[in-house]
């Protein structure tokens, strides 16, 4: 069969080769492969200013294989697509486009955001945090004794970091003023860190107020509960002065 095709092609192409290389069924010196052996894909390969036919077992990047009865070729993906499964389903987009459901888009649809690493449109992920851990013991300068007024803190973990368009994380640290019965430090206690001692329960009537840690506040979006107008702030300062325990500003 190959020989008969070779003879026939000679009529259209005077310099048809009898023995074709690399999977060609018929070929010519000028055009390269004219047709391919079964299961191989015909493709045009640019060599300088010239395009020649080649027969490939799989198609190069930017092309997908189309199979029709006894005739296969490499077909170009769409202009905005780098690799594709077929004409209508892209698997990797060209630079500047984002992949979404097999299509390449300039911008991601509503409710999705661009992942600039994978170049895909992905769901927006909001921050998730754990419940607060218990308050730490009341300490001052790292000690749990030898003072009346100190601070205690509590923390919570970020379970899920937000994506670019997701809600930012709320504060993960909170610090508040606390009071303890003034007691002298025993030998060996001096300098012991609060976390090494059992947490002392506050005395009856002790008032405490949580103050979010400034570092975690800076990185968060304003949370409605934290909003206060200036009048409310002044009012609170007056009330706080009247209380036996003062509340510090965010530090």
């Amino acid at each position: 069969q190959n020989a008969s095709r070779g003879r026939r092609q000679r009529r259209m192409h005077p310099n048809v080769s009898q023995g074709c290389q690399g999977g060609c069924a018929t070929c010519s010196d000028y055009n390269g492969c004219l047709s391919c052996k079964p299961r191989l894909f015909f493709a045009l390969e640019r060599i300088g200013m010239k395009q020649i036919g080649v027969c490939l077992s799989s198609c190069p990047s930017g092309y997908y294989g189309t199979r029709y009865p006894d005739i296969n070729k490499c077909t170009k993906c769409k202009a905005d697509c780098d690799t594709c499964f077929n004409k209508n389903f892209c698997t990797k987009c060209k630079s500047g486009f984002y992949l979404h459901l097999g299509k390449c888009l300039d911008n991601c649809p509503e409710g999705l955001e661009a992942n600039n690493h994978t170049m895909e449109c992905v769901s927006i992920v909001h921050c998730e945090v754990s419940e607060w851990n218990p308050w730490s013991p009341c300490t001052k300068k790292g000690k749990t004794c030898g003072f009346k007024r100190g601070t205690e803190t509590r923390v919570r973990e970020i379970i899920q970091h937000p994506s670019a368009k997701g809600n930012l994380c709320p504060p993960t640290n909170e610090t508040r003023k606390c009071t303890v019965q003034r007691k002298k430090c025993q030998k060996g206690e001096r300098g012991k860190k609060g976390r090494e001692r059992k947490r002392k329960k506050p005395n009856k009537g002790e008032s405490k107020e949580a103050i979010p840690d400034s570092k975690s506040l800076e990185s968060s979006k304003e949370i409605p509960e934290q909003r206060e107008n200036k009048q409310q702030q002044k009012k609170r300062k007056v009330q706080d002065k009247q209380k036996s325990v003062s509340v510090s500003t965010v530090h």
Partner: antibody, heavy 119, light 107 residues
Framework: EVQLVESGPGLVKPSETLSLTCTVS????????WNWIRQPPGKGLEWIGY???????YQNPSLKSRITISRDTSKNQFSLKLSSVTAADTAVYYC?????????????WGQGTLVTVSS | DIQMTQSPSSLSASVGDRVTITCKAS??????LSWFQQKPGKAPKTLIY???RLVDGVPSRFSGSGSGQDYTLTISSLQPEDFATYYC?????????FGQGTKVEIK
């Protein structure tokens, strides 16, 4: 030189089946791809389908349900059957061949045969 | 299916004129384009394949160019025997589709 000659009735009644044969000389239909193309009077060309060197066929989806393309290798002929014809199927029907993507497309044509659909 | 839009649908020219016919595909057809010449009552004749390759025996005044979606057939110096209808054909995928044709008439 490859030659293709179409033959078949020039007149077909509506709802009947149009049958044409293309006889090939100068090459074997067991190589290449053998096509049917039609051209309504005063209009453009429409590709109908092909039968390959192995006998596999592919038809234009717009006509697929009505088309049958077959071959007889012993006579070096291939045929077209188009069922349930209407006046819109009145056209000159051509057979033509190509050998692969790297060579001339429809390098050889038959002279064409006019088929009129009329009662 | 890929649509082929050919223009102009007809043109009048004189012998010796340079004539250009264009074909625009509805999507990138990657150079898989042929041009045909058809005279009244005759079968079409292949002039050019793979955008710019001349079929053996076709005069060199015929040339093809283009890429992507846009393709052109140029007749550098129109001869009396060139008055005919010209069609483009894409064969990037099946079904194959032809342009509507351009009739080149004597001015």
């Amino acid at each position: 030189e490859v030659q293709l000659v179409e033959s078949g009735p020039g007149l077909v009644k509506p709802s009947e089946t149009l049958s044409l044969t293309c006889t090939v000389s100068g090459d074997s239909i067991t190589s290449g791809y053998w096509n049917w193309i039609r051209q309504p009077p005063g209009k453009g060309l429409e590709w109908i389908g092909y039968i390959s060197y192995s006998g596999k066929t592919y038809q234009n989806p717009s006509l697929k349900s009505r088309i049958t393309i077959s071959r007889d290798t012993s006579k070096n002929q291939f045929s077209l059957k188009l069922s349930s014809v209407t006046a819109a199927d009145t056209a000159v029907y051509y057979c033509a061949t190509y050998y692969g993507y790297g060579g001339p497309w429809f390098a050889y044509w038959g002279q064409g045969t006019l088929v009129t659909v009329s009662s | 299916d890929i649509q082929m839009t050919q223009s102009p649908s007809s043109l009048s020219a004189s012998v010796g004129d340079r004539v250009t016919i264009t074909c625009k595909a509805s999507q990138d057809i990657d150079s898989y384009l042929s041009w045909f010449q058809q005279k009244p009552g005759k079968a079409p004749k292949t002039l050019i394949y793979l955008t710019n390759r001349l079929v053996d025996g076709v005069p060199s005044r015929f040339s093809g160019s283009g890429s992507g979606q846009d393709y052109t057939l140029t007749i550098s110096s129109l001869q009396p025997e060139d008055f005919a209808t010209y069609y483009c054909l894409h064969y990037d995928e099946f079904p194959l589709t032809f342009g509507q044709g351009t009739k080149v008439e004597i001015k």
